[in-house]
Amino acid sequence: RGVFRRDAHKSEVAHRFKDLGEENFKALVLIAFAQYLQQCPFEDHVKLVNEVTEFAKTCVADESAENCDKSLHTLFGDKLCTVATLRETYGEMADCCAKQEPERNECFLQHKDDNPNLPRLVRPEVDVMCTAFHDNEETFLKKYLYEIARRHPYFYAPELLFFAKRYKAAFTECCQAADKAACLLPKLDELRDEGKASSAKQRLKCASLQKFGERAFKAWAVARLSQRFPKAEFAEVSKLVTDLTKVHTECCHGDLLECADDRADLAKYICENQDSISSKLKECCEKPLLEKSHCIAEVENDEMPADLPSLAADFVESKDVCKNYAEAKDVFLGMFLYEYARRHPDYSVVLLLRLAKTYETTLEKCCAAADPHECYAKVFDEFKPLVEEPQNLIKQNCELFEQLGEYKFQNALLVRYTKKVPQVSTPTLVEVSRNLGKVGSKCCKHPEAKRMPCAEDYLSVVLNQLCVLHEKTPVSDRVTKCCTESLVNRRPCFSALEVDETYVPKEFNAETFTFHADICTLSEKERQIKKQTALVELVKHKPKATKEQLKAVMDDFAAFVEKCCKADDKETCFAEEGKKLVAASQAALGL
């Protein structure tokens, strides 16, 4: 029944090529290279991938051939280090090439850039895309993998293969349709939005492993899988957690071939053992490999077993609590987390982890006390405020969302977060606050029992985006503190931040509030971003501005844009009315 008990292979590269097949092998090597060397041109990467593939084929033919016994890190690292323009393009990353494995790979990993200086992907006309697709389907799909991978250096590689398969299917279907655009554009929008969400979710997994360690990731996985598979026994959940941890450790570490191979094995194991895991897996397990793995990862929670006994008997009332804890601390805590999580699909994973941490802290203290039972007897009472805090926060914010709608709810969050951490760059504040604001439409529609896991676990993903972007250019001690102290308390830490009283308001710069006629041709989303950028800048200039003052200025701004976009001479309108707006805004805010 073991998944990862493979015999040693003479040639690792031949082993992976045979396991994955040529198409997946090439795609995964391309993703790996693009995630490491994010600035390299597409053609250079394709050349490197072809060279690696040809070499792999020689190893398949003869595993004893020269260099076939080398590790994948050695082979891939050597290949990356042949890039001629490494120092000019990547600066100090070129120093990685002077190191030996495993330090060289660690060095490449440290230079992955979450916010690379790359142009925004502009979608060509549908006819242009369809022509390119028909002219050279293989190159077209490789280009998709390359462009996504270099912009999302932690994208979950086997899942990117699934996205590419859907991308290909969309073009295959829609380029033959009568109305190509009506068919294709909604599909591409959906893939884009799902892709961004997938990237952000995986980024949190990698941050969890890299910044907080394997134990933190395993705890997250125990909680989530116990919610999803409440009928599975603890031993089964433990096994799945161990295997899943290996898969994500590999992908986050750049070992994409091993990761994809092991993910396929894990999906196979789950489907072979679905009777002992979950009744919801049947449909997933009938699908082809990429769809199957995706489906399992997204599968709905199974029904909870009937008549589960009270947790108190084994974890509070039993005289053996301290003995069982001392015997195997992590197993006992894992069992506590499993039992709590399978009973509470209505809690967020991070809340479950806070409860487990509180339980652990209590046992550490009480098992050393004179009367341990007396000491830990009320431990479940300590959970009440921890549960109520996210419940109340979600209730308040969903009420606000329902009252304001998404755009204005995002604006409320923009103001709130700019006041908390005004040192953070405006683009980051806009991006993060917009995403935080999406929690409303994503989660507030759910019934009470699904709101918390939807909202708080989504907020963890978004706040991790803030943390990784801030880590690249740290500007706020408060952000650093909330990001690094505790993974599960990030959201409560940010929620608890008040207005930063130490912040010195930004000097007023009229240029920041100067707009041109090009705003009129922007999409609604891009226009919103322009307005929200201005709102953040306003708050940075006047952090003590009231909601009413900011609302008045933003209303005036919206009216100004609408008026000038309807004017015959738009540019003149923006110039003249813009000056008036800036003056009126300064007066209104007392700038």
Epitope: E233, A235, K239, T242, N324, E327, A328
Partner: nanobody, 118 residues
Framework: EVQLLESGGGLVQPGGSLRLSCTAS????????MGWVRQAPGKGLEWVSW????????YYADSVKGRFTISRDNSKNTLYLQMNSLRAEDTAVYYC???????????WGQGTLVTVSS
């Protein structure tokens, strides 16, 4: 401290039956997957069968399916293995094992020898 004590082994003719028992102490028996592992002379360890903590799900190696039945009594902290239609290839030391992980067992007993021979 965890203790697993097997009993019920012995010499039996091909086609015969035996019932192995394993009495557990030192841990909360009802929390853990329990199983039987065997080691034939000169061979490695092999999972024979395991049972979920609540007894609702069982697994059997292909070589024993339809002949062996695993069961447990959580009120008595005891695990059983009913072995019918025994064959010469079932000859082995049978160990009772405690597992917190589907791929691993963390404790096992001293073992009881089952010899199937005419």
């Amino acid at each position: 401290e965890v203790q697993l004590l097997e009993s019920g082994g012995g010499l039996v003719q091909p086609g015969g039956s035996l019932r192995l028992s394993c009495t557990a102490s030192g841990f909360t028996f009802r929390h853990y997957r329990m199983g039987w592992v065997r080691q034939a002379p000169g061979k490695g360890l092999e999972w024979v069968s395991w049972i979920r903590p609540d007894g609702t799900f069982t697994y059997y190696a292909d070589s024993v399916k339809g002949r062996f039945t695993i069961s447990r009594d959580n009120s008595k902290n005891t695990l059983y293995l009913q072995m019918n239609s025994l064959r010469a290839e079932d000859t082995a030391v049978y160990y009772c094992a405690k597992s917190y992980h589907a791929d691993k067992f963390d404790y096992w007993g001293q073992g009881t020898l089952v010899t199937v021979s005419s």
